[in-house]
């Protein structure tokens, strides 16, 4: 009996035309939503003038439907048993699941000012930047609508730069009509234990953002894992959002719509400093902001973002060192709301429910030559927003799953 089930499972989780896995893999049957909470800065003048703590107040959720587009350019390679694809990006605003509209205004860090002052450290260049910042009446902070902040706006300061630069700025710009990839993953035909594991991303087995093992593309994309998942396993997956591979460990048994699933969570150890977790040494890329690699809970992904000083963390700096959150008032981290988890059906390895949570932060540093940053007396890793991307198997699919998979076993 069990052998027959194993054989059926192995057959049905292969990523090729005609299998259950393939159909749901090409276009997810689950509705996926991405909720945003924006950190609205309450005291912009005091921060700029006196280097005060930044007082933030989160506003949200603002919800978008995402991952509704089918994978594109799906190409099987029979020779190495892989399938390659592009994952198109799309986001549709959901007013009924949001606290306001895309036209809501927020006071946030001026992304262009913070990034330009970080990228161009030369004193003479900073003097030029300063004159352009002044000419455009730009400041350390800015008021932007949700739509502008997420999807892009024409920056008045960058528009004055006398050589060709991208003048459109946005945390997720460009997004709609773009695609993530190319991904090339094992289809599992020759070896089911490799199914969905990424072989290459953008044609490479490494990212070229990190040193050593940190640069590796490990595991799957977290939408599914090879079947017959054990509680003792460490599940590796790659997330292009955070420009790195990461891992999840078993936390608890959960009943999801009558389906027994394993809840895997991202442990605090994954965000620890190299002092606590030596494996993380290669995620520490500089010594000053990281206080000689003793700070933890924030990941400098500037190499992956054309040099812009973007730092990724968990929402509200969950699992981050006190020095990171010390200059920011108004944060309340808690595990239940702010950690990432995956609920995996262990027989098939399918992720039937998930909550991916992350926070986007930007580093801003004092600058002698840039007046709007001149009064700062310390570095700030400024939270801009946090997001919660969730998906849960639908009732109909859950019924089908129960009858065809878990029901057969029980």
């Amino acid at each position: 009996g069990d052998l027959l089930i194993q054989k059926t499972i192995k057959k049905q989780v292969v990523l090729e035309e005609g299998t259950i896995a393939f159909k749901n893999w090409v276009k997810t049957g689950t509705e996926v939503y991405r909720q945003f909470w924006i950190f609205d800065v309450q005291n912009p003048q005091e921060v700029m003038m006196n280097s005060s703590n930044i007082q933030v107040k989160q506003r949200g959720p603002y919800t978008y439907r995402v991952r509704f587009l089918a994978k594109e350019n799906v190409t099987q390679d029979a020779e190495d048993n892989t399938v390659s694809f592009l994952q198109p990006n799309g986001a549709i605003f959901e007013p009924s699941l949001s606290v306001g509209t895309e036209a809501d205004n927020f006071t946030v860090l001026n992304l262009a000012v913070a990034a330009a002052s970080h990228i161009y450290q030369n004193q003479f260049v900073q003097m030029i930047l300063n004159s352009l910042i002044n000419k455009s009446k730009s400041s350390m902070f800015q008021v932007r609508t949700l739509r502008e902040l997420l999807w892009g706006y024409r920056d008045p300061f960058l528009s004055l730069v006398p050589y060709p630069v991208t003048t459109t700025v946005g945390l997720f710009y460009p997004y709609n009509n773009t695609a993530d990839g190319v991904y090339k993953v094992f289809n599992g035909k020759d070896n089911i234990s490799k199914v969905a594991i990424i072989d290459t991303y953008k044609g490479k087995r490494n990212l070229s953002y990190w040193e050593s093992h940190c640069d590796m593309i490990n595991g799957t994309d977290a939408a599914s894992f090879p079947p017959f998942v054990e509680k003792s396993q460490v599940l590796q997956f790659f997330s292009s959002d955070i420009c790195r591979s990461i891992y999840a460990v078993f936390e608890s048994d959960v009943n999801l719509k009558g389906i027994p699933v394993y809840r895997f969570v991202l442990p605090s150890k994954a965000f620890a400093s190299p002092v606590e977790n030596p494996d993380n040494y290669c995620f520490c890329t500089e010594k000053i902001i990281s206080k000689n690699c003793t700070s933890y809970g924030v990941l400098d992904i500037s190499k992956c973002k054309e040099g812009r000083p973007v730092y990724i963390s968990l929402p509200h700096f969950l699992y981050a060192s006190p020095d990171v959150s010390e200059p920011i008032d108004g944060l309340n981290p808690n595990e239940e709301e702010h950690r990432t988890y995956l609920d995996i059906e262990p027989i098939t390895g399918f992720t039937l429910q998930f909550a991916k949570r992350l926070q986007v932060n930007l580093l801003v540093k004092p600058s002698e030559k840039i007046q709007v940053l001149k009064n700062l007396k310390r570095n700030y890793i400024v939270p801009i927003l946090w997001l919660n991307e969730t998906g849960t198997i639908g009732d109909e699919k859950a019924n089908m799953f129960r009858s065809q998979v878990t029901g057969k076993i029980n």
Epitope: S131, S139, P156
Partner: antibody, heavy 123, light 112 residues
């Protein structure tokens, strides 16, 4: 102290052009916008446009495009406005006014104004 | 263009009285740099306008504290707590958030 000294009154014929000047002192001329404002007798104020002397960048009120041309000479710290194809509706007092923005520390709008130049268009 | 509507057109007052002038804009004057560029000027006959209040509520240097400004978004007010003879003239509100900059039509403060 900041001073804006404008050129004297002008009496010009219809269809002609006139160029009025505004000499700045007491601040860094090249890094502050210079605005020009029109006021017809007994009327309100109308913004014509502005120039950034450092690079000659300009913004115009659509209504004055083709009528006014703004220029600046950083070596003499002087801003100029040329008005062309003059008609009676161009008879007015014209003011220059500086607009400083210094990293949020000095940010007052149009804080200092010239004394005004009267332009009379008459045949 | 942003339309600035000032009321009243004329404001007759007795010396020592309080005066209040309203200014309404056709769209929000909140600039992307977090400032609101709404200013108040006083113009006396034969003179150029003089800046009184900048960015809604800040008194320009040398302006007496009997002048105060308030408001946000699209609604703004200038108050003079005790009118003195030297305060008479035409008051203009102005916005420099959006190009082209625009002015209110003016309010003439005169003796009753």
């Amino acid at each position: 102290q900041v001073q804006l000294q404008q050129s004297g009154p002008e009496l010009v014929k219809p269809g002609a052009s006139v160029k009025i000047s505004c000499k700045a002192s007491g601040y860094t001329f090249s890094t502050s916008w210079m605005n020009w404002v029109k006021q017809r007798p007994g009327q309100g104020l109308e913004w014509i446009g502005r120039i950034y002397p450092g690079d000659g960048d300009t913004n115009y009120n659509g209504k004055f495009k083709g009528k006014a041309t703004l220029t600046a000479d950083t070596s003499s710290s002087t801003a100029y406005m040329q008005l062309s194809s003059l008609t009676s509706v161009d008879s007015a007092v014209y003011f220059c006014a500086r607009e400083v923005y210094y990293g949020g520390y000095e940010d007052y709008g149009m804080d200092y104004w010239g004394q005004g130049t009267s332009v009379t268009v008459s045949s | 263009d942003v339309v600035m509507t000032q009321t009243p057109l004329s404001l007759p007052v007795s010396l020592g009285d309080q005066a209040s002038i309203s200014c309404r804009s056709s769209q929000s004057l909140l600039h992307t740099n977090v400032n609101t560029y709404l200013h108040w000027y006083l113009q006396k006959p034969g003179q150029s306008p003089k800046l009184l209040i900048y960015k809604v509520s800040n008194r320009f240097s040398g302006v007496p504290d009997r002048f105060s400004g308030s408001g946000s978004g699209t609604d703004f007010t200038l108050k003079i707590s005790r009118v003195e003879a030297e305060d008479l003239g035409v008051y203009f509100c102005s916005q420099s958030t959006h190009v082209p900059y625009t002015f209110g039509g003016g309010t003439k403060l005169e003796i009753k």
